[in-house]
Every structure is written in structure tokens, then in C-alpha cells.
């Protein structure tokens, strides 16, 4: 056997070359042959009128020819034949690849709450051979669930993904991503997620700022609260009592001027939104004011005093439940 | 310009015979390949016999092998097919075909207009 050929993989649309090669040639005539076994060419003659066949080369040793605008149709097996004595017959198997037409991806719900379950689908449609889908929430890969349908040599891909929400993936970019012979570079679509969630409150003391609340002093808090959609009413309560009669609250913020001992107890924000309330609490303690130490005649001493205060923030963020968010001052 | 007619089909009945012949002119006849190529009602192109410049080495599809024979004579430009025992599958439109070039380097596929053959009982 001294007649060779190779096999051909194409991307539909573009050109395939087929090449029947004769090693050791004694002139002997090289004829091609379609899949149907319909003579392409012999020798430099091309009894098929299809225009998208045209001569390459031809020698003794070789015929060369190109197929051009390839399509699915044209798949299969293409015959080299030599007419020699005996007859001898290679055959180059053509390879047509199809990427897929277009990537669709399909969520379920356009707003997700936090904690909810969701279904993402991606569909790459008409490929072949079938496309490997991925996907991604960000730049962390996820687990897909692939359903492959066959049509007519053609595969349409669906794949699904199960994706349970937090707060943190809102505004976070799911990627499907498809894989595929007949596809170079990134081939990918992707949507934004939305997801609301309930109120994540703060109580920042803005006033004093040392921390340390004395008699006589002012104390100026303010509660941060962040939720999706934004909370609408921020609240100020004290628990377990009522509001000292000096006391001023203005949107966000609350004012106590003139501390005492009576005010000392637990102040409360509160915060909600459609998703669900929460709440931060701040436990004030007021201290005496700093005593005054006569001079002495003879001699000065000057004694400082450092206090530390710890402020330690328990938050339970359970949807639709109150938390219980405690500030404490040591 | 090149020019090839054929002539000699017609309608016979199975198992008889036809003699196609093609008349050509317009190129140095002598110095191509000759070839006959066929097309059935409904079908693609097929092709049928080769003969080399000389006709010393002539070539036939399957189909038509050991019934078929393909000729030549250069000193005439005519080339023909002779046809035995014919098939009801034989029923076409005959072709003859050459691939020459007239006063350039570029070679061309020539084919004639047809001739049609019907094998009918």
C-alpha cells in the first residue's frame, strides 16, 4: 500500500483540504470520491458540478483538492483511489465541527431574597459535537446539571444550576461559559444577581469620643443600617423604659445631652425593610464625673487614670426574627 | 472555443446497445484526456469512463464495467461509448467532458450538452 491520506477536522462554514499522496508513483491515475461514492475528481477532471471543489494540486504523486463553505452535509468518509494492479483505495475521514449557535441564559426569579433557592438555566443551542457548559458565581466555579438533546447530528445543551442566595452575591455576576472544539477564546454569557436582604444594623457612638460616659456630658449615637431595598424607617427605643425627656432624636441619630444616672439602661435602633427587621442595642452606663482633688500646700502630684472600654457586638441576623445585638461598656 | 456535441442516444430496450459518439473542436483534441459523465433523472452526476490521450488506457465506474467500453479517434476528434446490455438504471443524460486549455495556461472543465439515453421496455 503505497497511497496515503489524513483525516480532515473542520469548522463548518470554513475550508477543508483533502490529499490523496502516492509514494512511490508510476503514473498511475488518482481518483477522489465522495462519502456516496460519486467520483470528485479524476485526475484533474471534476465530474461533480459543485463549484466548492476546486484542484489544489495535481501530479502523479498527489491530488490535492479543497472544499470550500464545509457543512455538516459534507461529513464523512472521501475516497482516494489508485488505479494501479491491483486497485488500491485510501480512505480520509472529514469531521465537520459546529459551534453553537447562540448561548441563552435564563433566571428564574429577576429578584431573589436572601436564603432563597433559585434555578439558572443555559442553553447552547445546535453544536456539534455537544458543548461542555461551566459555570460561575464571580471567579468561583460552580456544579451544573447537563441535559444533552440530539437533533439531526446537532446537540442542544441545557444546563441547570441550583444556586441558594446570600446577601454578599448581590450585584455578583453568574458566567456560563461554554466549551467547545470549534471555539476559541471565552464563549460566555452572564447575568447580575439581585438579591435582597434584611437590614444589617450598627450603633456607632459619634460623641464622646473616648467612649467613656461621665454625668454631666453629652452622648451622640448613630445607627448605620444597610439593607436591600435600603431600610425605610429607622428607630430609636430604650428598652424596657421610656425615652429620657432630654432626649433628641433626629433620623438616625440619637442626642442626650446632660447625662445622669438615670439614664443609664439598654437604647435600641431598629430597622426593617420588606425582607425583614433587625436591631442593634447599646448598653449605656453613665459614670460619676471626675472628682477634683485639692492642691496640696507643699507639694503637686498628678495622678492620670486610663480606661478602657470594650465594645462587643453580638448579631443575630436570622430573617424576620429579632436579633439581639448588645453593646456593653466595661 | 471548445466545443463538444454528442449525438447517438435515444430509447432501447433492456439488454440492447447504443453507440454514443462526441464530436469536438476547438482544441488540440489529441493532446486531452477525454471523459463521459452521466446524470439520471432525479440523481447527481456520475462519472462513467476515462480514455487517455492515446487511448491506449481507458478506466469505467463500477457500474458500468465489463458493459461498457469507451474510445477514441484522434484523427476524427470523436470520441465515443459503446453500450451493451443495458439496464434500466443506465437511462440518463450522457455527457461528454474534457478538461483543456484554449491559448492559456488555465485549464478548464469543458462539458458538452447531453445526449439522452432511455432503457425502457
Known amino acids: 500500500q503505497n497511497l496515503f491520506t489524513k483525516d480532515v477536522t473542520v469548522i463548518e462554514g470554513e475550508v477543508a483540504t483533502i490529499s490523496c499522496q502516492v509514494n512511490k508513483s508510476d503514473d498511475s491515475v488518482i481518483q477522489l470520491l465522495n462519502p456516496n461514492r460519486q467520483t470528485i475528481y479524476f485526475r484533474d477532471f471534476r465530474p461533480l458540478k459543485d463549484s466548492r471543489f476546486q484542484l489544489l494540486n495535481f501530479s502523479s504523486s498527489e491530488l490535492k483538492v479543497s472544499l470550500t463553505n464545509v457543512s455538516i452535509s459534507d461529513e464523512g468518509r472521501y475516497f482516494c483511489q489508485l488505479y494501479t494492479d491491483p486497485p488500491q483505495e485510501s480512505y480520509t475521514t472529514i469531521t465537520v465541527l459546529v459551534p453553537p449557535r447562540n448561548l441563552m441564559i435564563d433566571i428564574q426569579k429577576d429578584t431573589a431574597v436572601e436564603g432563597e433557592e433559585i434555578e439558572v438555566n443555559c442553553t447552547a443551542m445546535a453544536s456539534k459535537p455537544a458543548t461542555t457548559i461551566r459555570w460561575f458565581k464571580g471567579n468561583t466555579e460552580l456544579k451544573g446539571k447537563s441535559e444533552v438533546e440530539e437533533w439531526s447530528d446537532m446537540y442542544t445543551v441545557t444546563s441547570q444550576l441550583m444556586l441558594k442566595v446570600h446577601k454578599e452575591d448581590d450585584g455578583v455576576p453568574v458566567i456560563c461559559q461554554v466549551e467547545h472544539p470549534a471555539v476559541t477564546g471565552n464563549l460566555q454569557t452572564q447575568r447580575y444577581l439581585e438579591v435582597q436582604y434584611k437590614p444589617q444594623v450598627h450603633i456607632q457612638m459619634t460623641y464622646p469620643l473616648q467612649g467613656l460616659t461621665r454625668e454631666g456630658d453629652a452622648l451622640e449615637l448613630t445607627c448605620e443600617a444597610i439593607g436591600k431595598p435600603q431600610p425605610v424607617m429607622v428607630t430609636w427605643v430604650r428598652v424596657d423604659d421610656e425615652m429620657p425627656q432630654h432626649a433628641v432624636l433626629s433620623g438616625p441619630n440619637l442626642f442626650i445631652n446632660n447625662l445622669n444616672k438615670t439614664d443609664n439602661g439598654t437604647y435600641r435602633c431598629e430597622a426593617s425593610n420588606i425582607v425583614g427587621k433587625a436591631h442593634s442595642d447599646y448598653m449605656l452606663y453613665v459614670y460619676d464625673p471626675p472628682t477634683t482633688i485639692p492642691p496640696p500646700t507643699t507639694t503637686t502630684t498628678t495622678t492620670t487614670t486610663t480606661t478602657t472600654t470594650i465594645l462587643t457586638i453580638i448579631t443575630d441576623s436570622r430573617a424576620g426574627e429579632e436579633g439581639s445585638i448588645r453593646a456593653v461598656d466595661h | 472555443q471548445v466545443q463538444l456535441v454528442e449525438s447517438g442516444g435515444g430509447l432501447v430496450q433492456p439488454g440492447g446497445s447504443l453507440r454514443l459518439s462526441c464530436a469536438a473542436s476547438?482544441?488540440?483534441?489529441?493532446?486531452?484526456?477525454m471523459y463521459w459523465v452521466r446524470q439520471a433523472p432525479g440523481k447527481g452526476l456520475e462519472w462513467v469512463s476515462a480514455?487517455?490521450?492515446?487511448?491506449?488506457?481507458?478506466y469505467y465506474a463500477d457500474s458500468v464495467k465489463g458493459r461498457f467500453t469507451i474510445s477514441r479517434d484522434n484523427a476524427k476528434n470523436t470520441l465515443y461509448l459503446q453500450m451493451n446490455s443495458l439496464k434500466p438504471e443506465d437511462t440518463a443524460l450522457y455527457y461528454c467532458?474534457?478538461?483543456?486549455?484554449?491559448?492559456?495556461?488555465?485549464?478548464?472543465?469543458?462539458w458538452g450538452q447531453g445526449t439522452q439515453v432511455t432503457v425502457s421496455s
Open positions: 467532458a474534457t478538461r483543456a486549455s484554449v491559448g492559456t495556461l488555465e485549464m478548464y472543465d469543458n
Open positions: 476547438g482544441f488540440t483534441f489529441s493532446s486531452y484526456w
Open positions: 480514455i487517455n490521450t492515446g487511448g491506449g488506457s481507458t
